[in-house]
């Protein structure tokens, strides 16, 4: 057979679908690998072929499109399961070819079981919403293309295992779920169950979104350095261990990169000859505000070390902050100048 452009296994597309539910999977070739769409390819005389490798097998085999009730079918560039079964799990390949051209890609498909409370190994998308913001809407995801616009499905929303009925600030509106002045107590997994008829059968689609209520942009601030501060003096004798925590509060800012670093006499720790250890820890509040602590330690401090200028720096998308630590040698009666 002719050479085929093999894009390998596209692990970026870890497709997960629920057992006993419809699934429509588009061939990734047209979405990520080729410059043209299916219609163009088809009109140019190219054919799309599907095959698969079962879980824990090496043998590629054709997909059986002659199952009862057309359980698996292909429509244009979409592979349909109506519905899935657990043993449909495997690596699926779509190949586009004619006598002179061939291109193919494989992708993993995992059929996942769920319990009556929608608990499963499924990875859910996370929707972040701002605390106390006016109205946030989430939309039941990934249901496009399952039924025609003429079909009006029934939609039921759940928080965890509980159907959302008379929730005070959460209102189901068909495919949408509206949150009014959200609070941290609105955090959780929200599931929509979409039920629609097709050829005399009822199908269910289950989709879950994890809601995380986060700090509002109106509360966003530049970094706030809690420690070091002007009230604490690190007074040490030569030979003792010097430990200075740099503790910084970052309010939640979407996609912000929060940084904390030390300078010693204006240089990064890696650029000085002092034997310094820096350990970092991070904790988060309920609204994903971040407290980042970098502990600078010198096991056996020298008189020279006690004359150095130790400055904690912090930066986020709102600004920068810096604060010098007050370090002095025990008993010599003077604090070194802390000019920045």
């Amino acid at each position: 057979s002719e050479r085929c452009d093999d894009w390998g296994l596209d692990t970026m597309r870890q497709i997960q679908v629920f057992e006993d539910e419809p699934a429509r999977i588009k061939c990734p070739l047209f979405e990520h690998f080729l410059k043209y769409n299916y219609s163009t390819a088809h009109s140019s005389g190219l054919t799309l072929i599907w095959y698969w490798t079962r879980q824990d097998r090496d043998l590629e085999e054709p997909i059986n499109f002659r199952l009862p009730e057309n359980r698996i079918s292909k429509e244009k560039d979409v592979l349909w399961f109506r519905p899935t079964l657990l043993n449909d799990t495997g690596n699926y390949t779509c190949m586009l070819r004619n006598t002179t051209y061939c291109s193919k890609v494989a992708f993993p498909l995992e059929v996942v079981q769920k319990d009556s409370c929608f608990n499963s190994a499924m990875r859910f998308p996370v929707h972040k919403m701002y605390i106390e913001h006016g109205i946030h809407k989430i939309t039941c995801p990934n249901v496009d293309g399952y039924f025609p616009s003429s079909v009006k499905p029934s939609v039921t929303w759940y928080k965890g295992c509980t159907e959302i009925v008379d929730f005070h600030n959460v209102l189901p509106e068909g495919m949408n779920l509206s949150f009014f002045i959200p609070l941290v107590s609105n955090n959780g997994n929200y599931t929509c169950v979409v039920t629609y008829p097709e050829n005399g059968r009822l199908f269910h689609l289950t989709r879950t979104v994890t809601v995380k209520v986060v700090g509002s942009p109106k509360d966003a601030l530049p970094p706030q350095i809690y420690s070091p501060n002007d009230r604490v003096v690190y007074e040490k004798e030569p030979g003792e261990e010097l430990v200075i925590p740099c503790k910084v509060y970052f309010s939640f800012i979407m996609d912000s990169h929060n940084e904390v670093w030390w300078t010693i006499d204006g240089k990064k720790p890696d650029d000085v000859t002092v034997d310094i250890t820096i350990n970092e820890s991070v904790s988060y509040s309920s609204t994903e505000d971040e407290t980042r602590t970098q502990i600078l330690s010198i096991k056996k401090v020298t008189p020279e070390d006690l004359r150095r200028n130790y400055v904690c720096h912090a930066r986020n998308t709102k600004g920068e902050a810096e604060q010098a630590a007050k370090v002095k040698q025990k008993g010599n009666g003077c604090t070194e100048p802390m000019t920045l």
């Epitope: 605390i131 106390e132 913001h133 006016g134 109205i135 005070h168 600030n169 009014f180 002045i181 609070l183 941290v184 107590s185 509002s216 109106k218 309920s286 609204t287």
Partner: antibody, heavy 118, light 107 residues
């Protein structure tokens, strides 16, 4: 200094309407969610309504839902409560209060008395 | 909705004594609980938020504790100006709800 000053209370007949106002000063009004809390004579406190800082989100106690409307004008630093179809059980002192998810109702107005009676 | 229950309804205490007020939530409110003081003819005043953080300007004799469903407001040494009605309020879930109040009176 944070100040909240309610006005618009008074005597009204059952079925009537009243509009309460709350003038805010001493803080950035548009940055805070606001609420109304009422207190019937000799009784405890009851949350009535809340509005988000941007004015888009509103919430109501079941006892007033469909009859009361909360709104705000951030350009005027003013909070409103439109009260329709008033009932005798709505008789209370109505307080406007600033709130924040960390610190609850941290500042209150002095209140305005609404009396619903024929 | 979350029901807040305060006890006792009335607490008789002598000036200088310690007063302990309780508040129970019908379900967990985490640490999202506030305490207010109200004197006759006045608006409520925030004392404690986050179950244990004193609001600005509140004397150190007022302290709050608890989380989840059980909360306590303690006034370590009652002053004459502390005789008032105290309300707890949860702000974890909508609708925000208040306890029915505890009246602290002079013994």
């Amino acid at each position: 200094e944070v100040q909240l000053l309610e006005s618009g209370g008074g005597l009204v007949q059952p079925g009537g309407s009243l509009r309460l106002s709350c003038a805010a000063s001493g803080f950035t009004f548009r940055d805070y969610a606001m609420g109304w809390v009422r207190q019937a004579p000799g009784k405890g406190l009851e949350w009535v309504s809340a509005i988000s800082y941007d004015g888009e989100g509103t919430l109501y106690a079941d006892s007033v839902k469909g009859r009361f409307t909360i709104s705000r004008d951030n350009s005027k630093n003013t909070l409103y409560l439109q009260m329709n179809s008033l009932r005798a059980e709505d008789t209370a002192v109505y307080y406007c209060a600033r709130f924040h998810y960390r610190s609850a109702f941290d500042y209150w107005g002095q209140g305005t008395l609404v009396t619903v009676s024929s | 909705e979350i029901v807040m229950t305060q006890s006792p309804a009335t607490l008789s205490v002598s000036p200088g004594e310690r007063a302990t007020l309780s508040c129970r939530a019908s379900q967990s409110v985490s640490s999202n609980l506030a305490w207010y003081q109200q004197k006759p003819g006045q608006a409520p005043r925030l004392l404690i938020y986050g179950a244990s953080t004193r609001a600005t300007g509140i004397p150190a004799r007022f302290s709050g504790s608890g989380s989840g469903t059980e909360f306590t407001l303690t006034i370590s040494s009652l002053q004459s100006e502390d005789f008032a009605v105290y309300y707890c309020q949860q702000y974890n879930n909508w609708p925000w709800t208040f306890g029915q109040g505890t009246k602290v009176e002079i013994k």
